[in-house]
């Protein structure tokens, strides 16, 4: 996470903090992974574009009984606290591909790191 350094100094909290915290949580999950994450549960792949946070939440919420990702679910809810409308929701998912939660987390992490580097904090 060296590219995410430099934000620990005092002073105004940048708008990137929520994104950085989410990235750090995903890093923790991937680094602490011993057995298959969430017992190898499968989730829908998503479009890593507009509405990504809501889409990621909608996909991961279908994994039950996996405490390892509950904090991630709640942090994603920070970006997407109220349900999107039915019209918006239909475009969030790619309902043709399922991947393991571990791969989903890795893909999401890579994309969020890219957004962070590019300064796209919301």
């Amino acid at each position: 996470l060296t590219c995410l350094g430099g934000f620990a100094s005092p002073g105004p909290v940048p708008p990137s903090t929520a994104l950085r915290e989410l990235i750090e949580e995903l890093v923790n999950i991937t680094q602490n992974q011993k057995a298959p994450l969430c017992n190898g549960s499968m989730v829908w792949s998503i479009n890593l574009t507009a509405g990504m946070y809501c889409a990621a939440l909608e996909s991961l919420i279908n994994v039950s009984g996996c405490s390892a990702i509950e904090k991630t679910q709640r942090m994603l809810s920070g970006f997407c606290p109220h349900k999107v409308s039915a019209g918006q929701f239909s475009s969030l998912h790619v309902r043709d591909t399922k991947i393991e939660v571990a791969q989903f987390v890795k893909d999401l992490l890579l994309h969020l790191k890219k957004l962070f580097r590019e300064g796209q904090f919301n």
Epitope: L22, L57, E58, I61, N62, G78, C80, P81, K83, N122
Partner: antibody, heavy 118, light 111 residues
């Protein structure tokens, strides 16, 4: 330990304004959505406003255009600016951490009383 | 707006009793396999406390005597064996549609 402490309540005349504050501690404030929920004396609960970690705001029609929710992540603080106050806005106003539509409101402050009366 | 109707509005019970509170939504609050219904407990002069989220999930730290069930429009909060600290008012809340709405509350009193 998560703590939410509201302040700023008091007596205000109809048509007046008031700004409520909520000081948060014990969690990474900037990573979570926050809300205000109110409760009129002897009545039930009513959702008033929400703000996402990305500063998107949400309001019911009853307060839209009169109330503004905002946050200052540097100060770990949540605010509710209330304008054009009416008698029916009299209530205890609670600050709550919002863990989204799938998780509800897991943490609440103790509340601050707003009385709108002439 | 989705109307939430709780019943009964109040009830009297004794310590050890099994208590059931129901909440009926004016339209379904189900979404993608989840019921967006939550239950809170409130004691006089205190803030509400989350007990159950998504209809049946026990919030961390909440005693296992509390349970929730239901889907669609009909939901139930059950206290398997009422304890002295459970005398309070209970509210249901939906988050499926803005504005989020609460039920009118059910006051559980000592018989």
């Amino acid at each position: 330990e998560v703590q939410l402490v509201e302040s700023g309540g008091g007596l205000v005349q109809p048509g007046g304004s008031l700004r409520l504050s909520c000081a948060a501690s014990g969690f990474t404030f900037s990573s979570y959505a926050m809300s205000w929920v109110r409760q009129a004396p002897g009545k039930g609960l009513e959702w008033v406003a929400s703000i996402s970690s990305g500063d998107t705001t949400y309001y019911p029609d009853s307060v839209k255009g009169r109330f503004t929710i905002s946050r200052d992540n540097a100060k770990n603080s949540l605010y509710l600016q209330m304008n054009s106050l009416r008698a029916e806005d009299t209530a205890v106003y609670y600050c709550a951490r919002l863990d989204g539509y799938y998780f509800g409101f897991p943490y609440w402050g103790q509340g601050t009383l707003v009385t709108v009366s002439s | 707006d989705i109307q939430m109707t709780q019943s009964p509005s109040s009830l009297s019970a004794s310590v050890g009793d099994r208590v059931t509170i129901t909440c009926k939504a004016s339209e379904s609050v189900d979404h993608s396999g989840s019921s967006l219904m939550h239950w809170y407990q409130q004691k006089p002069g205190k803030a509400p406390k989350l007990l159950i989220y998504r209809a049946s999930n026990l919030e961390s730290g909440v005693p296992s005597r509390f349970s929730g069930s239901g889907s669609g429009t009909d939901f139930t909060l059950t206290i398997s064996s009422l304890q002295p600290e459970d005398f309070a008012t209970y509210y249901c809340q939906q988050s499926n549609e803005d504005p989020w709405t609460f039920g009118g509350g059910t006051k559980v009193e000592i018989k």
